[in-house]
């Protein structure tokens, strides 16, 4: 149910792309096509083919994305094209001058001189945005976002963007400015990460990550699965990043038990987070078989 | 830190029954607690936990017979249905080592236990 | 349920001897074992965590270690006081969690 063709608007088509781009990037990271057949791996990158092509139509001039191009570029939705671009750059082929494009507008056009990224085009589609959706701490918790897409860009385009780098510091100096006053467990993990990114996440800022997950296991605000899912899994990236190899199966177990493998209304995030986390878990830790992901893709009927 | 079991009596072959643990010098809002069982003479058994959201794990035998609830920041109640005289035992709770996951950081401390005897 | 096979089942060792006990678990449960003391008539206590850690206030003679799907409680320099039965707690997941039958060590 997660290889899916996209279609629609610029936020739906991301909405569509997202879990086939996150399903082969996991099938490949934990090399388990052959439970599904390896052709079908081909017909997933055609959809992911698709769904970049499309996702073109919705490139504004200066190279940042909306809904629709009759209004006003949105920094998430931007920032969420890069992160989903860079991913799926080591799957299909990727124009660097579009990925980068929306780089240099996330860091020209939308990053203040306090280091923060301002969304002046909010998303329509709210159900894609995750924990963000929540307004509370946004400024910190966009930054991180922004941030984390950067990251995961820098290597495809730090030779095309120069700004990047200081960028990347500067909205890093305002994450450890804030970091000690966050309330959200949501904005403590995906800003621990971002530190964690850029081997900041030490004293005080860890034991005020370490100290925000419940039980030693999540990060968790009542009621929010979804939000849950998706903090958690940005906590185990930095977890990950740290090797602290010690805190991480709790993690995974908690993750692994929730028994969500992506899809549905609003679930844009925590697929995303839920399956790259895993991924990187099965990647970083050896001998991983108490993971036991039951994980089915189908793809659509042609 | 201190818990303790209460509610153990001598009931007839399916009659239903409620343990509770009572703990003291924390609260169960920040805290994991599992409940483990002995028979007379026997090894030690884990029935299951819950988490300090409410959330509950059993063992595979237990699920359906056995209810973990947590019914105040202070008390974890153990419900069981169609007892059989295969339930007699010493009940146990403990809480999570430094309010974790009890099956990865262990469980301390625990309560002295209350033993139930299940008799015709 | 045979996620943990434990041996010996009894054991005995003369003061300042060692004790090994090692618990086999069915499947990789990573460091998902503790190790128990319990003494006649007194709740378990907590020994070891995650496979090896020691926890709070216990002598250092304690030891745990593991070696792939095996798991080894090691008691070094043993006391009158450790005579008691030994038990591993090993979880695959939630579900499938089990003590190990334990062991009843006797100090000569």
């Known amino acids: 149910h997660l290889i899916v063709t996209p279609a629609g608007c610029g936020e739906q088509n991301m909405i569509g792309m997202t879990p086939t781009v996150i399903a082969v990037h996991y099938l490949d990271q934990t090399e388990q096509w052959e439970k599904f057949g390896i052709e079908k791996r081909q017909e997933a990158l055609e959809l992911i083919k698709k769904g970049y092509t499309q996702q073109l139509a919705f490139k504004q001039p200066s190279s940042a994305y909306a809904a629709f191009n009759n209004r006003p570029p949105s920094t998430w939705l931007t920032a969420y094209v890069v992160k989903v671009f860079s991913l799926a750059a080591n799957l299909i082929a990727i124009d660097s001058h579009v990925l980068c494009g929306a780089v240099k507008w996330l860091i020209l056009e939308k990053q203040k001189p306090d280091g923060v990224f301002q969304e002046d085009g909010p998303v329509i589609h709210q159900e894609m945005i995750g924990g963000f959706r929540n307004a509370k701490e946004a400024d910190v918790s966009l930054t991180a976002f922004v941030l984390i897409a950067l990251q995961e860009a820098r290597d495809i385009c730090e030779g095309q963007v120069n700004s990047l780098p200081g960028s990347i510091n500067k909205a890093g100096e305002y994450i450890e400015a804030s970091y000690m006053n966050l309330q959200r467990p949501y904005t403590v993990a995906i800003a621990g990460y971002a530190l964690a990114l850029m081997n900041k996440l030490e004293e005080p800022y860890l034991g005020k990550f370490l100290n925000t997950a419940k039980d030693r296991n999540r990060w968790e605000e009542p009621d929010q699965q979804l939000y849950n899912v998706e903090a958690t899994s940005y906590a185990l990236l930095a977890l990950l990043l740290l090797k602290d190899f010690d805190s991480v199966p709790p993690v995974v177990r908690w993750l692994n038990e929730q028994r969500y493998y992506g899809g549905g209304y609003g679930s844009t995030q925590a697929t995303f987070m839920v399956f790259q986390a895993l991924a990187q878990y099965q990647t970083d830790v050896p001998d991983h078989k108490d993971l036991n992901m039951d994980v089915s893709f189908h793809l659509p009927s042609r | 830190q201190s818990l303790e079991e209460s509610g153990g009596r001598l009931v007839t072959p399916g009659t239903p029954l409620t343990l509770t643990c009572t703990v003291s010098g924390f609260s169960l809002s920040r805290y994991t607690m599992a409940w483990v069982r002995q028979a007379p003479g026997k090894g030690l058994e884990y029935i299951g936990w819950?988490?300090?959201?409410?959330?509950t794990y059993y063992a595979s035998w237990a699920k359906g017979r056995f209810t973990i609830s947590k019914t105040s920041s202070t008390t974890v109640d153990l419900k069981m249905t169609s007892l059989t005289t295969e339930d007699t035992a010493t009940y146990f709770c403990?809480?999570?080592?430094?309010?974790?996951?009890?099956?990865?950081?262990?469980?301390?401390?625990w309560g002295p236990g209350t033993l139930v005897t299940v008799s015709s | 349920d045979g996620v943990m096979t434990q041996t010996p089942s009894s054991t005995s060792a003369a003061v300042g001897g060692t004790v090994t006990i090692k618990c086999q678990a069915s499947q990789s449960i990573r460091s998902w074992l503790s190790w128990y003391q319990q003494k006649p008539g007194q709740p378990p206590k907590l020994l070891i965590y995650?496979?090896?850690k020691l926890a709070s206030g216990v002598p250092s003679r304690f030891k745990g270690s593991r070696s792939g799907t095996e798991y080894t409680l090691a008691i070094s320099g043993v006391q009158r006081e450790d005579a008691a039965t030994y038990y591993c707690l090993g979880s695959i997941a939630s579900d499938d969690t089990a003590f190990g039958a334990g062991t009843n060590v006797e100090i000569k």
């Open positions: 995650e496979a090896s």
């Open positions: 403990a809480s999570g080592n430094d309010g974790g996951d009890p099956l990865y950081y262990g469980m301390d401390p």
């Open positions: 819950i988490d300090s959201s409410g959330s």
